[in-house]
């Protein structure tokens, strides 16, 4: 757990300032030898891996989408796994590596030459009928930060948070993610409760802004500890 | 390869604040995790704080939680250590350092492969 790594933080052996590997406590992470890790249609070992919880794909790394590692599995248990490489099967463009979105259902590269005109065609095609989900997965319409130069302004479809201009980050709204400003002192925020609470909103709220941190309001007394106010508070 | 530099370190009286940064060039910031540690004069250097590539994902020593924020702004390749309520024993050399957050793991656990220099923060009594 990260308090017991805490409990021994130091680290021995100095990296050097610049390149080289990093002598960090844990860096070697345990793991059951063979552990598989799934990609794509097969799966492939990767040394030292341990499955992450998740709740959305901003908690996994870049070459990672989070899912319920089965099919139809139980969509409150998500692990962090590992990209689909082009040509593989996909339902939304988190699921594919970088570099690539998904297009019909396949992994394909976001080649900047005819990218653009594809990506309106793909937006249409997820959202001109239904909003259903398919195999658990919802459907979305996120777009990789190394697909475009410019930065997204509000209402933007994006994928992360860096993909959206500074004031903005990247907030689910209905099935898709758009840039969305960041909420400013006063501003009503979203406290999750519990870890995967906010896998569920449809109208996500971005974060509080620099110094500002999502507390209860001083002045909101209501009996219901969960239905109390939470605002963005200067720290 | 990343360049890190850090900045905002200073002489500070108990109980004040400083805002350290770490601005980063070369490879792509916005998909490496970034993590803070410190050195305090004859002692090791120990880990702070970490955030990762989408600032989703953030981790705390427990001597600075509840004191310490980490941020990051990607559209300006940067990373923030806010230092509120300073103790002497925060005296130390703050040094921000990146690694590639290709897998999801514990914070405290990446492999640093990029370092600043460092910067001194100073905490009088």
């Known amino acids: 757990t990260l308090n017991s790594v805490l409990n021994s933080n130091a680290i021995k052996n100095l990296p050097p300032p610049l390149g080289g590997a990093a002598g960090h406590p844990g860096s070697a992470v345990s793991a059951a030898p063979g552990i598989l890790y799934p990609g794509g249609n097969k799966y492939q070992t990767i040394d030292n891996y341990q499955p992450y919880p998740c709740a959305e794909d901003e908690e996994c790394g870049t070459d990672e989408y989070c899912a319920s590692p089965t099919r139809g599995g139980d969509a409150g248990v998500q692990i962090c796994l590992a990209c689909r490489k082009r040509r593989k099967r996909c339902m939304r463009h988190a699921m594919c590596c970088p570099g690539n979105y998904c297009k019909n259902g396949i992994c394909v590269s976001s080649d900047q030459n005819h990218f653009r005109g594809e990506i309106e065609e793909t937006i249409t095609e997820s959202f001109g009928n239904d909003h259903s989900t398919l195999d658990g997965y919802s459907r979305r319409t996120t777009l990789s930060s190394k697909m475009y130069h410019t930065k997204g302004q509000e209402g933007s479809v994006c994928l992360r948070s860096s993909d959206c201009a500074s004031g903005l980050c990247c907030a689910r709204h209905f099935w898709s993610k758009i840039c969305k400003p960041v909420l400013k002192e006063g501003q009503v925020c979203t406290k999750h409760r519990r870890k995967g609470s906010h896998g569920l909103e449809i109208f996500q709220r971005c974060y509080c802004g620099e110094g500002l941190s999502c507390r209860i309001q001083k002045d909101h007394h209501q009996a219901s500890n969960s239905s109390r106010l939470h605002t963005c508070q200067r720290h | 390869e990343v360049q890190l530099v850090e900045s905002g370190g200073g002489l500070v009286q108990a109980g004040g604040s400083l805002r350290l940064s770490c601005t980063a060039s070369?490879?792509?910031?916005?998909?490496?995790?970034v993590g803070w540690f410190r050195q305090a004069p004859g002692k090791e250097r120990d880990f702070v704080t970490a955030?990762?590539?989408?600032?989703?994902?953030?981790a705390y020593a427990d001597s600075v939680k509840g004191r310490f924020t980490i941020s990051r702004d990607n559209a300006k390749n940067t990373a923030y250590l806010q230092m509120n309520s300073l103790k002497p024993e925060d005296t130390a050399v703050y040094y921000c350092?990146?690694?590639?957050?290709?897998?999801?793991?514990?914070?405290?656990?990446?492999?640093?492969?990029?370092w600043g220099q460092g910067t001194q923060v100073t905490v009088s009594s």
């Open positions: 070369g490879s792509a910031f916005s998909s490496h995790v």
């Open positions: 350092a990146a690694g590639r957050d290709r897998y999801a793991r514990d914070l405290t656990e990446y492999e640093y492969l990029w």
């Open positions: 955030i990762n590539w989408s600032g989703a994902r953030t």
